[in-house]
């Protein structure tokens, strides 16, 4: 999950596997102030998971979340 410093959440590691799409309810990008660019997926259990925005499955999920 993202590490919060001065209320700005940043990610220092990415999930290495696809999350079930049906378990994800929303997403947000971490701040440009963070050293690593990241997408944070929020699951239906309200867990926050850091993901690599360059991964194909991450881009696919973002597209489908934008359309829904």
């Amino acid at each position: 999950s993202p590490y919060s410093s001065d209320t700005t959440p940043c990610c220092f590691a990415y999930i290495a596997r696809p999350l079930p799409r049906a378990h994800i309810k929303e997403y947000f990008y971490t701040s440009g102030k963070c050293s690593n660019p990241a997408v944070v997926f929020v699951t239906r259990k309200n867990r926050q998971v850091c993901a690599n925005p360059e991964k194909k499955w991450v881009r696919e999920y973002i597209n489908s979340l934008e359309m829904s």
């Epitope: 596997r17 999350l19 079930p20 799409r21 378990h23 699951t43 867990r47 194909k56 999920y61």
Partner: antibody, heavy 119, light 108 residues
Framework: QVQLVQSGAEVKKPGASVKVSCKVS????????MHWVRQAPGKGLEWMGG????????IYAQKFQGRVTMTEDTSTDTAYMELSSLRSEDTAVYYC????????????WGQGTTVTVSS | SYVLTQPPSVSVAPGQTARITCGGN??????VHWYQQKPGQAPVLVVY???DRPSGIPERFSGSNSGNTATLTISRVEAGDEADYYC???????????FGGGTKLTVL
């Protein structure tokens, strides 16, 4: 080094259940996803389901929904796959597989457990 | 659900190049993994994320993914490469891992 060691071969009658175990060494069970894949004689690989640690949930392939249960005993670092209402088509080699190394792909596999369903 | 199509068999002479294809609708939008399985053994990951190679896998194994086809290429084929090869992707529409039907590589 991550290793998965599975339980021995089983022979079951139609309608019975089978429970296959997969003992993990070299890492903690909850760290990575654990999947189960089966292979009928002379056929291809078929994903049955798996545990998603970040989500804390197990997902099952539609085909096996309601008939398969995957559990984990974190105290012994052992994963289990139980398949009920067995029929002859369930005769197969059952593998556990995990993804500790390369981007979600199944990089470590158990040796396989042969399950034979015969009356 | 998502379908991956592989040729049932591919034959190649030793020292030649083998190409095993995996077809799927817009497969280039997905990360493809490849496994090698020898008789009586568990599968072994040989390529992940389209074209990356796990440590210990020879450089002769490479992968590509474009359009509707992913390809596993084995250059300078050896007798020991004879095996079944399976492609795999994550299908987010069903939240299922999907395997291709497998390709039997025969070294002549």
């Amino acid at each position: 080094q991550v290793q998965l060691v599975q339980s021995g071969a089983e022979v079951k009658k139609p309608g019975a259940s089978v429970k296959v175990s997969c003992k993990v060494s070299g890492y903690t069970l909850t760290e990575f996803a654990m999947h189960w894949v089966r292979q009928a004689p002379g056929k291809g690989l078929e994903w049955m389901g798996g545990f998603v640690p970040e989500d804390g949930e197990t997902i099952y392939a539609q085909k096996f929904q309601g008939r398969v249960t995957m559990t984990e005993d974190t105290s012994t670092d052992t994963a289990y796959m139980e398949l009920s209402s067995l029929r002859s088509e369930d005769t197969a080699v059952y593998y556990c597989a995990t993804d500790p190394l390369y981007e979600g792909s199944f990089s470590v596999w158990g040796q396989g457990t042969t399950v034979t369903v015969s009356s | 659900s998502y379908v991956l199509t592989q040729p049932p068999s591919v034959s190649v002479a030793p020292g030649q190049t083998a190409r095993i294809t995996c077809g799927g609708n817009n497969i280039e939008s997905k990360s493809v993994h490849w496994y090698q399985q020898k008789p009586g053994q568990a599968p072994v990951l040989v390529v992940y994320d389209d074209s990356d190679r796990p440590s210990g896998i020879p450089e002769r194994f490479s992968g590509s993914n474009s359009g509707n086809t992913a390809t596993l290429t084995i250059s300078r084929v050896e007798a020991g490469d004879e095996a079944d090869y399976y492609c795999q992707v994550w299908d987010s529409n069903t939240d299922h891992w999907v395997f291709g039907g497998g390709t039997k590589l025969t070294v002549l």
